[in-house]
C-alpha cells in the first residue's frame, strides 16, 4: 500500500527575468527514492537519478540548474514559462508519486510565493 504524500511549493509566481526554485518533498513513506523527473506539461526538463546523477534536457541546459536537493532552479524566466510543472518520484517499493506546481511568470514586480500546501498524490504501479 502506498502511504506517501507529495508536498510541493504549490502555486507560485515570479518575475520575468528572475529565477524560481521548484521543490517537492515526499513524506509519510519509508520508500527509497530512485529517480525524480521534472516535467513541464509533457516536456521533460530534468531527471535526478539516485545512482547516475542529473540529466538536464539539452533544450533547457542553459537556464535550468540542478538542485537544491532533488529540486530544480529555473532561471531567466519568460512569460512562456507560465504553466504546470510536475515532479514525478519513482520509489521502491511503492511505485510512482506525482506532485504538481503551478508557476505564473509576471511582467511586473508583484510576484509573490504562494503558501506551501499538499497535493493529493497520483500514483500508478508497474
Amino acid at each position: 500500500m502506498m502511504t506517501g504524500t507529495i508536498e510541493t511549493t504549490g502555486n507560485i509566481s515570479a518575475e520575468k527575468g528572475g529565477s524560481i526554485i521548484l521543490q517537492c518533498h515526499l513524506s509519510s513513506t519509508t520508500a527509497q527514492v530512485t529517480q525524480v523527473n521534472w516535467e513541464q506539461q509533457d516536456q521533460l526538463l530534468a531527471i535526478c537519478n539516485a545512482d547516475l546523477g542529473w540529466h538536464i534536457s539539452p533544450s533547457f541546459k542553459d537556464r535550468v540548474a540542478p538542485g537544491p536537493g532533488l529540486g530544480l532552479t529555473l532561471q531567466s524566466l519568460t512569460v512562456n514559462d507560465t504553466g504546470e510543472y510536475f515532479c514525478i518520484y519513482h520509489t521502491y517499493p511503492d511505485g510512482t508519486y506525482t506532485g504538481r506546481i503551478f508557476l505564473e511568470v509576471l511582467e511586473s514586480s508583484v510576484a509573490e510565493h504562494g503558501a506551501r500546501f499538499q497535493i493529493p498524490h497520483h500514483h500508478h504501479h508497474h
Partner: antibody, heavy 119, light 107 residues
Framework: EVQLVQSGAEVKKPGASVKVSCKAS????????MHWVRQAPGQGLEWMGR????????KYNEKFKSRVTITVDKLSSTAYMELSSLRSEDTAVYYC????????????WGQGTTVTVSS | DIVMTQSPDSLAVSLGERATINCRVS??????LAWYQQKPGQSPKLLVY???TLAEGVPDRFSGSGSGTDFTLTISSLQAEDVAVYYC?????????FGPGTKVDIK
Amino acid sequence: EVQLVQSGAEVKKPGASVKVSCKASGYTFTNYYMHWVRQAPGQGLEWMGRIDPDSGGSKYNEKFKSRVTITVDKLSSTAYMELSSLRSEDTAVYYCAREGHYGFYSDYWGQGTTVTVSS
Amino acid sequence: DIVMTQSPDSLAVSLGERATINCRVSENIYSYLAWYQQKPGQSPKLLVYNAKTLAEGVPDRFSGSGSGTDFTLTISSLQAEDVAVYYCQHHYGNPLTFGPGTKVDIK
C-alpha cells in the same frame, strides 16, 4: 550533422594506460552528456561512465571506478577516456556516445577505437 | 546490478515477415529501456528509447513495447538491411547495463 570522431587504434602493454579521445561536432558540446561504452571482441556492450561536459562532473561504473577517468576539453569539444593498469581483458573497441534528449540512453555513437593489450 | 536477458539468442526470419525480440529485466525499470541495432563492423545505432519512442530517422517498421520488467522490439516486415545484432539497455540506474544481444538473420 552530429559527429563523434574518435582517435586511432592503440596497442598497449599490460600495466600501461591508454587515453582515447572523442571530438564532437554538429551540436553544442556542453549541452549533452557523454558516455563511454566498450565492447570486447565478439562480446556485448559494457557501460563505463558518463560526464557532463559543462560542469565536468562524472559518474562511473563501479567495476571501472578505480581505473577509469573521463574528462573533457570544452574549448576543443573533445571528451577523453583514460583507462589505467591495463590487462589483456581490456582488449576491446571503446565507444564514446552522446546522451539523448530524454534520459540516460545514447543517441549518437563514435566510430569506435580499438585498444589491444598484449605483451 | 540490473541484469538484462534477451530471447531468443538468434532468429532467422523470411524477408517481409515479422521478427520479435524479447528483453527481460531483473527489476522494475518502468519504461526506461532503449533498443540498439549493431551491424557487423559498425557502431551501435539507437532505435528506440523510453521503451516505445522511435528515435529520429528510424523506419516505422520498428516498434517497441512493454514496461516494468518485460519489453519487446518488433520488426513488422523484415528487410535485408535489418540483418544485425539487437541490444536492449536499461537507462535507469548505475551501472547502465545491456542485454547480451539477439542476432537477426534472413531465412
